[in-house]
């Protein structure tokens, strides 16, 4: 299944999930992090306001699960909710789920590799309990805690490497990119909106790229 | 394209040494960690040991743990898997394996056959 | 136990549906993950991180998990099917991971 495949609009789209918009479209008023999707976005001010909190009411998920997470480390989740809430390029990575919370998710998403790797290096050192952060948690207190028999310990034991966290985190919502910053050809988490969001034509290079071979297929198809 | 290349098939003697090497290219060594697994003629994948090609961390199954040694050249993107105190059930594939996270090995080298025969 | 157990052999009928499973208790806390293997070849991972199909896998291959098992189904199997499969999983004590022992199927007709 190549990413993508349950949907034709592949550009300038909104993931059907828990917070996001239906259309991408300007947001004056976004929050810290979140405010280099202002110009358009799939989040709204109150959304992006409300996932720079500790223990968000977006999700109940609490980041400091095995004590206090350093701030250098927390940034990255915060930037890594802000592309997921609000980023109206990720459209060709959407694939359908059957899950209670959401209709649709990103899969294999692919994260310029120095993104990926500062993140890692800026939370090696914090506390963990478990090395994928979708399924397994204690949710009896109403916010996810560490199941039993799952120890704290460091970032660095449940993600040894920047591949274990930024692909096993999230059930693979993203892959690491061979390709770097700047490429056009990898979603950066984090760029300066004042050169303009530089995921947009990283989102159409691999439209174009799904339409090319959506195209072959259905080639080869015709001729057997 | 992301390729995994293993050096040539071995014949070693019961009690020696052989070391395996695989050659990464295609993409960032450093990111990601390598595992070995091996394969003995018609039997189970079984898992070795694994290392972060980043800082050299390493985990050995316990079944070959003093027996193996998983090491890298991360300036010529090359891991390594040591055997020593060979014996006849060491005859096996072995396979180096790329994770992209616990256990989801998506390239694997072509193999390696050592064969441990008197 | 770090064990996961497959059933050593299955076959299924040209075009039919077949499902290999892998039982283990990592598989409460941890994904599976699944490969084809075919004589004298390397395995080729079909599904990861329980139900994620790799690129260029068809797309009759899916994973599912349920408790302490997953299951890969294949859809429709044809000729080209007929392999070896095995499941395999992180075990969270000691980051090591662990292979089941395999299922060879057979494609009937």
């Known amino acids: 299944a190549d990413p993508g495949q349950d949907r034709t609009d592949l550009l300038n789209v909104c993931m059907d999930a828990k917070h996001h918009k239906t259309k991408p479209g300007p947001e004056d008023k976004l929050h810290d992090q979140c405010s280099p999707w202002k110009k358009n976005a799939c989040c709204t001010a109150s959304t992006s306001q409300e996932l720079h909190k500790d223990t968000s009411r977006l999700y109940n998920f609490n980041w400091d699960h095995c004590g206090k997470m350093e701030p250098a480390c927390k940034r990255h989740f915060i930037q890594d909710t802000c592309l997921y809430e609000c980023s109206p390029n990720l459209g060709p990575w959407i694939q359908q789920v059957n899950q209670s919370w959401r209709k649709e998710r990103f899969l294999d998403v692919p994260l310029c590799k120095e993104d990926c790797q500062r993140w890692w290096e800026d939370c090696h050192t914090s506390h963990t309990c478990k090395s994928n952060w979708h399924r397994g948690w204690d949710w009896t207190s109403g916010v996810n805690k560490c199941p039993a028999g799952a120890l704290c310990r460091t970032f660095e034991s449940y993600f040894p490497t920047p591949a274990a966290l930024c692909e096993g985190l999230w059930s693979h919502s993203y892959k690491v990119s061979n390709y770097s910053r700047g490429s056009g050809r990898c979603i950066q988490m984090w760029f300066d909106s004042a050169q303009g969001n530089p995921n947009e034509e990283v989102a159409r290079f691999y439209a174009a790229a799904m339409h090319v071979n959506a195209g072959e297929m259905l080639h080869h198809h015709h001729h057997h | 394209e992301v390729q995994l290349v293993q050096s040539g098939a071995e014949v070693k003697k019961p009690g020696a040494s052989v070391k395996v090497s695989c050659k990464a290219s295609g993409y960032t060594f450093t990111i990601y960690a390598m595992h070995w697994v091996r394969q003995a003629p018609g039997q189970r994948l079984e898992w070795m040991g694994w290392i972060n090609a980043g800082n050299g961390n390493t985990k050995y199954s316990q079944k070959f743990q003093g027996r193996v040694t998983i090491t890298r050249d991360t300036s010529a993107s090359t891991a390594y898997m040591e055997l020593s105190s060979l014996r006849s059930e060491d005859t096996a594939v072995y396979y180096c394996?790329?994770?992209?996270?616990?256990?989801?090995?998506?390239?694997w080298g072509q193999g390696t056959l050592v064969t441990v025969s008197s | 136990s770090s064990e996961l157990t497959q059933d050593p052999a299955v076959s299924v009928a040209l075009g039919q549906t077949v499902r290999i499973t892998c039982q283990g208790d990592?598989?409460?806390?941890?994904?599976a993950n699944w490969y084809q293997q075919k004589p004298g070849q390397a395995p080729v991972l079909v599904i990861y991180?329980?139900?994620n199909l790799p690129s260029g896998i068809p797309d009759r291959f899916s994973g599912s998990s349920s408790g302490n098992t997953a299951s890969l189904t294949i859809t429709g199997a044809q000729a080209a099917d007929e392999a070896d499969y095995y499941c395999d999983s992180r075990v969270s004590t000691g980051n090591h991971v662990v292979f089941g022992g395999g299922t060879k199927l057979t494609v009937l007709g």
């Open positions: 394996a790329r994770d992209i996270s616990y256990g989801s090995f998506d390239y």
């Open positions: 991180g329980q139900f």
């Open positions: 990592s598989l409460r806390s941890n994904y």
